[in-house]
């Protein structure tokens, strides 16, 4: 039963997007009063796993030695103290890449773009898929989704950007997926380098912050949960 205890923090190392076969560690951090930690996985019998706390008792480790489809999904953790169980942590979405063959990423009309103009990044898969994701390397929250309308299977998705500025420059990759599991992605596409040439107008020194690129509001951030943080890319459902 959820009580007044503060919720724990849940995270994954080395990250929450893991290639098939690689290891990942899920950490749940609560308080020094914790006696036990519980990890629940959505649509799996609860608890998915239980662990005793590591000294000094404020966190527990849940190890996945080799990532497979079975481990992909949405997790929450709890801890038990002498007064009862904590509230659940914010969810952690563990995504596995390598479930499908890699798509192809290209830029239309060209990966060389003048600031103030537009570009469309095109992600194409060999087999029909219903969800495509675009990521920009080193973006704070790099996942950006585009889902085809009415669940129709498509071979490609377009990620339009306009107006392009210097901040949009960088390295992009895309993934494809099926709607029945947003946690299973293809191998990543080969990288695409988007190069933005000088502004037509009044460029100013770029602030050192992460802003969006592609199919979402130009600087609108995006999290796999659909929440809106303060930097990165935005999830865009079509």
């Amino acid at each position: 039963q959820a009580g007044p205890l503060p919720k724990p923090t849940l995270w994954a190392e080395p990250g929450s997007v893991i290639s098939w076969g690689n290891s990942v560690t899920i950490w749940c951090q609560g308080t020094l009063e914790a006696r036990e930690y519980r990890l629940d996985k959505e649509e799996s019998p609860a608890p998915w796993d239980r662990q005793n706390p590591l000294e000094p008792k404020n966190k527990a480790r849940f190890s996945i030695p080799s990532m497979t489809e079975d481990y992909a999904g949405r997790y929450r953790c709890y801890y038990r103290s002498p007064v009862g169980w904590s509230q659940p942590s914010d969810p952690l979405e563990l995504v596995m890449t390598g479930a499908y063959s890699k798509p192809t990423l290209s830029a239309l009309p060209s990966p060389l773009v003048t600031s103030g103009k537009s570009v469309t990044l095109l992600c194409q898969s060999r087999s029909p898929m219903d969800t495509f994701l675009l990521i920009k390397e080193r973006a704070a929250h790099p996942l950006l989704h585009l889902r085809s309308e009415h669940g129709a299977q498509q071979h490609q998705a377009e990620f339009p950007m306009s107006p392009v500025t210097s901040v949009h420059g960088g390295t992009y990759r895309c993934f494809s997926s099926h709607g029945f599991s947003h946690y299973l992605l293809s191998h990543p596409s080969d990288p695409l380098e988007l190069i933005v040439s000088g502004s037509l107008e009044d460029p100013r020194p770029s602030p050192t912050r992460s802003v969006s690129t592609a199919a979402g509001p130009e600087d609108q951030p995006l999290m796999p949960t659909g929440s809106v943080p303060h930097s990165g890319l935005r999830r865009h459902w079509e």
Partner: antibody, heavy 118, light 107 residues
């Protein structure tokens, strides 16, 4: 709910100045580029200026370049348009609009009227 | 600058009619073409972006098509509340430019 509210319009003589403001709410203002668009009485829409989310890049229409200055204060969730050397042809309803990052303006304010007349 | 030519400038139709408006760009704008609705005394509202994508909350009777220089906006079955002026806008290259508008009236 996304809301954009313009203010600062009014009657000004040719050659005069005016500063328009746009107060934004219902979204993370600092994550979006913003535009000013104007509409002369009985006429169509004319894009005026654009400012990127972090003020890193700014663009102006040729008709206002050198006279108008777009700026923003992300801490105050506000967009501004400083209009100097106003001319009769600047008479219009001025709208602020949010950039969607895909070449469109997805939400607009209700507009503020600027009249330049002697 | 890219010129946008919209036609017709005015249009009269009956409730239930299929209504089509066209927009032509003076140069290739890919699919960066948007459509707005403006009612008298009100601000414009985005209906369609990137040629054919429906903005959030917009009824499915509105649609768009085209690419390059020629674009079409369609209302499949005209409703009384659709009486307004419609503008196209290219978002391919700054400065962004608008068509002259199409004033839609009820017969």
């Amino acid at each position: 709910e996304v809301q954009l509210v313009e203010s600062g319009g009014g009657l000004v003589q040719p050659g005069g100045s005016l500063r328009l403001s746009c107060a934004a709410s219902g979204f993370t203002f600092s994550d979006y580029g913003m535009h000013w668009v104007r509409q002369a009485p009985g006429k169509g829409l004319e894009w005026v200026a654009y400012i990127f989310s972090g003020s890193s890049t700014i663009y102006y229409a040729d008709t206002v370049k050198g006279r108008f200055t777009i700026s923003r204060d992300n801490a105050k969730n506000s967009l501004y348009l400083q209009m100097n050397s106003l001319r009769a042809e600047d008479t219009a309803v001025y709208y602020c609009a949010r950039a969607d990052g895909r070449g469109a303006m997805d939400y607009w304010g209700q507009g503020t009227t600027v009249t330049v007349s002697s | 600058d890219i010129q946008m030519t919209q036609s017709p400038s005015s249009l009269s139709a009956s409730v239930g009619d299929r209504v089509t408006i066209t927009c032509r760009a003076s140069q290739d704008i890919s699919k960066f073409l948007n459509w707005y609705q403006q009612k008298p005394g009100k601000a414009p509202k985005l209906l369609i972006y990137y040629t054919s994508r429906l903005h959030s909350g917009v009824p499915s009777r509105f649609s768009g098509s085209g690419s390059g220089t020629d674009f079409t906006f369609t209302i499949s079955s005209l409703q009384p509340e659709d009486i307004a002026t419609y503008f196209c806008q290219q978002g391919n290259t700054l400065p962004w430019t608008f068509g002259g508008g199409t004033k839609l009236e009820i017969k």
